[in-house]
Interface confidence: low
């Protein structure tokens, strides 16, 4: 089948004690094999500091998944979501300022 690149969306949600959860969602991609991971200062975080969702069908013949990690508020600029799918890859920053989500479609 044809390759459908993911739509990648990065969001932040506030949690307690000066920490926030940043979530990177990949949706509408095919085939289902994908790498999605958080990087700090350009290097992937260890597995035990990230939480992954299952790769699930989204009802359109494509798939969706997510990865999340907790970071200190004010340190958002150090973190990026790295995506690799069907030979294509991309890096997505955590939105800065008042913007709380960012999405981009890979071609």
């Amino acid at each position: 089948g044809s390759t459908v690149p993911p739509m990648v969306n990065v969001t932040c949600s506030e949690v307690s004690e000066g920490n926030i959860t940043v979530t990177c969602r990949a949706s509408s991609f095919y085939p289902r094999n994908i790498t999605l991971t958080w990087r700090q200062d350009g290097v992937s975080l260890s597995h035990n500091t990230q939480q992954w969702g299952d790769v699930l069908p989204d009802g359109n013949g494509t798939y969706q998944t997510w990865v999340a990690t907790r970071i200190r508020q004010g340190e958002e600029q150090r973190f990026t979501c790295y995506m690799e799918h069907s030979g294509n890859h991309g890096t997505h920053p955590v939105p800065s300022g008042n913007s709380h989500h960012h999405h981009h479609h890979h071609h």
Epitope: D41, G42, V43, S46, E75, R78, T80, T91, P93
Partner: antibody
Framework: EIQLVQSGAEVKKPGSSVKVSCKPS????????IYWVRQAPGQGLEWIGY????????IYNQQFKDRATLTVDKSTSTAYMELSSLRSEDTAVYYC???????????WGQGTLVTVSS | EIVLTQSPATLSLSPGERATLSCSAS???????LHWYQQKPGQSPRLLIY???NLASGVPARFSGSGSGTDYTLTISSLEPEDFAVYYC?????????FGQGTKVEIK
């Protein structure tokens, strides 16, 4: 073998600028950030900032934000650090380094001595 | 800014002796973000220990690291002639990334 090769020593006048290059090899240039650090004679290590070669994101130590400019040329896999409005206290060895696990500096260039003197 | 204070500034020891170097942080940092470097005269720093206690590639087993919170230690169990150098701790937990001022291990 991972190596970072820096440009040669420079002597500059106060008020001028200097641009130091750093050419890594032995790994994919865009896969790790490039850090810049300086060391004044007989002193400790001071972090200037870093650049993500893949997306061009730059993070500066606030102390250098107004005078340092970090850039990359992906076509030649080379990173650059330019420091403007030089003063005598900028005399130092300037190092580039590769980002490692948990924000450490895992490989270093050989250093570039920048001397600022009138 | 997290300030790292190393002590002592200079450590005068003989080959074969044990060296204990301290690094104290002005506020608590995760042990995952504390690293140690060795620098010899005229050379670039070299990563020695990462994440508090993990030896970097090629580093001899006589080096070890420990600590948590605000207090970290680098230990050299039995000094070899090539170990006389300056040692720096570094934190990567918060910006700006900072180094300690260094501890010089010199021959007594």
């Amino acid at each position: 073998e991972i190596q970072l090769v820096q440009s040669g020593a420079e002597v500059k006048k106060p008020g001028s600028s200097v641009k130091v290059s750093c050419k890594p090899s032995g790994y994919a240039f865009t896969s790790n950030n490039i850090y810049w650090v300086r060391q004044a004679p007989g002193q400790g290590l001071e972090w200037i900032g870093y650049i993500d070669p893949y997306i061009g994101r730059i993070i500066y130590n606030q102390q250098f934000k107004d005078r340092a400019t970090l850039t990359v040329d992906k076509s030649t896999s080379t990173a650059y650090m330019e420091l403007s409005s030089l003063r005598s206290e900028d005399t130092a060895v300037y190092y580039c380094s590769r980002s490692g696990e948990r924000s450490n500096f895992d490989y270093w260039g050989q250093g570039t001595l920048v001397t600022v003197s009138s | 800014e997290i300030v790292l204070t190393q002590s002592p500034a200079t450590l005068s020891l003989s080959p074969g002796e044990r060296a204990t170097l301290s690094c104290s942080a002005s506020s608590s940092i995760s042990s995952n973000y504390l690293h140690w470097y060795q620098q010899k005269p005229g050379q670039s720093p070299r990563l020695l220990i990462y994440r508090t206690s993990n030896l970097a590639s090629g580093v001899p087993a006589r080096f070890s690291g420990s600590g948590s919170g605000t207090d970290y230690t680098l230990t050299i169990s039995s000094l070899e002639p090539e170990d006389f150098a300056v040692y720096y701790c570094q934190q990567g937990g918060s910006l700006p990334l900072t180094f300690g001022q260094g501890t010089k291990v010199e021959i007594k």
